[in-house]
Amino acid sequence: LTCLGGFASPGPVPPSTALRELIEELVNITQNQKAPLCNGSMVWSINLTAGMYCAALESLINVSGCSAIEKTQRMLSGFCPHKVSAGQFSSLHVRDTKIEVAQFVKDLLLHLKKLFREGQFN
C-alpha cells in the first residue's frame, strides 16, 4: 500500500490518503446516483473482514457496462496485492447471497469509514 500512484497524484500515495480517496469516491457514487446504481446489477456480498479489498474487487469486477463503478474497481485493485479477473473468487469469498450494487457500495462505505476513524489504513 505504499505505492498507490495514479489515483490522484503521480507518486506514491500514503495508505491514509488512498483510503480517504476511496471513501470519497464511494460517497460520490452514492450521492450522485439518480437511477439504481449499475441499473440493478446484483453482486456477491462479502465478509467485511480479512481480505476485504480483494473480495470487494472480486465481486465488483464481474459487473460490466457500469461506468459509475469503474473508478472504484481501479482503486480497489490498488489495495489488493494480487491480480483479480472476472469470475475469480478467493477462499475468503463465501458466496452465500447476492445484493444490489447500490447496497454493496453502501455497506462497503460504512465499513471503510469505520476503519478510517479507527486509523486502520491497511
Epitope: P36, C38, N39, G40, S41, M42, V43, N62, V63, S64, G65, C66
Partner: nanobody
Framework: EVQLLESGGGLVQPGGSLRLSCAAS????????MDWVRQAPGKGLEWVSS????????YYADSVKGRFTISRDNSKNTLYLQMNSLRAEDTAVYYC?????????WGQGTLVTVSS
Amino acid sequence: EVQLLESGGGLVQPGGSLRLSCAASGFTFSDYEMDWVRQAPGKGLEWVSSIDNSGFSTYYADSVKGRFTISRDNSKNTLYLQMNSLRAEDTAVYYCAKAFSTFDYWGQGTLVTVSS
C-alpha cells in the same frame, strides 16, 4: 439482442409446487452464470438463487434453501427454478437474469401468487 423469457408462474396454494422456466437467446447461454431474482409487491429486489455456467455449482438465499432448486439445460438454452413447499411470502414477480448484468439483460418476469 439478449432475450430472456420466463414462464410457469401462476396461482398456487400454500404447500404447493411450481416450476419456472426461462428461455434465453441472443448470447452464448452456456458461458454465463444465471440468477433468479424476485420482487414482492411493494418490496425491493431479492436474490433467490444462482447457478454457474456449467450447472455444477448452485447457490440459494436462506429463505428458499431446501425448498427451491435451480437448474439449467445448456443444450436448450433454458434456466429452471423448481419451487416446492411454497409459502405466502414467496408471492412475487420472478425474474431470470444474466448474472452481474443490468436490467437490460433481465426477463420481463413471471408472477407467482401463493394463496389459499
